[in-house]
Amino acid sequence: IFKKEQAMCLEKIQRANELMGFNDSSPGCPGMWDNITCWKPAHVGEMVLVSCPELFRIFNPDQVWETETIGESDFGDSNSLDLSDMGVVSRNCTEDGWSEPFPHYFDACGFDEYESET
């Protein structure tokens, strides 16, 4: 399942790059799989929010991206995730790349990596 989620993530990132016109030389933060969940590409200044992953949920590669990007266009969007909710983790896209997750996964989600033994 871990490998499958990673593969699905890379697929999603590729599709998002095409939609957003991202390439290797684009400024901003590349999409990434951080060994826990999937982060879509973002522009500098954007905050991306994700829900805590369900550990053994199998991704549907055709579903909409499960993160929300907070930019000016997203303000007031009642469908977007909210950092004031529990079980939500954010990263900022800065000129130096992705920030650390906030809160840390262990505090927001109750775990901080997929276990090597299950």
């Epitope: 950092l83 909710d85 529990m86 505090d107 109750g110 090597s116």
Partner: antibody, heavy 123, light 107 residues
Framework: QVQLQQSGPGLVKPSQTLSLTCAIS??????????WNWIRQSPSRGLEWLGR?????????HYAVSVKSRITINPDTSKSQFSLQLNSVTPEDTAVYYC?????????????WGQGTLVTVSS | DIQMTQSPSSLSASVGDRITITCRAS??????LNWYQQKPGKAPKLLIY???ILQSGIPSRFSGSGSGTDFTLTINSLQPEDFATYFC?????????FGPGTKVDIK
């Protein structure tokens, strides 16, 4: 019924190492659901979380920055207990020290506590 | 570190009273907040976690509310065994800081 039983000396000299042990019954230090924490309480600093150890396929620790350079929390799987070591103590480390189990349900909380050990740092 | 403050620092009340204790965080903590009760010479006891979920075995006269930076613990119909000190604790960022406590004593 989870119970935590603390043991260790109540008097430690300045610059020495404070060592306390917390024996677990009704649960295991190797539980994949729990964390095992140390907290202290003094009139000057109130309740202060110090750190935790936990097992998720491998052992991990998180420590409070205020004591990070001086603290070690170690599990002992053979006895299902965990220990606190605080090095280079000063009188400011005088406090009641508690061990506690952390559990997760939407957030981490401390649901079972040891009885507390008053540790005085004095020469 | 996130600073947790509580008000009042102490209050006097009578059996049967309804009391409210406030806890404020120095930055938003969503609902990552716990409440504990402590009696003299004893360890703290968990009452409420995640802002408003009652711990198993805790009487329903205790309730928690709030989100973000402002939280309240309410005790409806105060009982003799409720005279104690109450602490809030944020559970979102290491170190997991506690409030200074609110002492509830008999009027």
């Amino acid at each position: 019924q989870v119970q935590l039983q603390q043991s260790g000396p109540g008097l430690v000299k300045p610059s020495q190492t404070l060592s306390l042990t917390c024996a677990i019954s009704g649960d295991s230090v190797s539980s994949r659901q729990a964390t095992w924490n140390w907290i202290r309480q003094s009139p000057s600093r109130g309740l202060e979380w110090l750190g935790r150890t936990y097992y998720r396929g491998k052992w991990k620790n998180h420590y409070a920055v205020s004591v990070k350079s001086r603290i070690t929390i170690n599990p002992d799987t053979s006895k299902s207990q965990f220990s606190l070591q605080l090095n280079s103590v000063t009188p400011e480390d005088t406090a009641v020290y508690y061990c506690a189990r952390g559990m997760w349900q939407g957030n981490w909380f401390l649901d079972h506590w040891g009885q507390g050990t008053l540790v005085t740092v004095s020469s | 570190d996130i600073q947790m403050t509580q008000s009042p620092s102490s209050l006097s009340a009578s059996v049967g009273d309804r009391i409210t204790i406030t806890c404020r965080a120095s930055q938003s903590i969503s609902r990552y907040l716990n409440w504990y009760q402590q009696k003299p010479g004893k360890a703290p006891k968990l009452l409420i976690y995640a802002g408003r979920i009652l711990q198993s075995g805790i009487p329903s006269r205790f309730s928690g509310s709030g989100s973000g930076t402002d939280f309240t613990l309410t005790i409806n119909s105060l009982q003799p065994e409720d005279f104690a000190t109450y602490f809030c604790q944020q559970a979102i960022i290491n170190p997991y800081t506690f409030g200074p406590g609110t002492k509830v004593d008999i009027k």
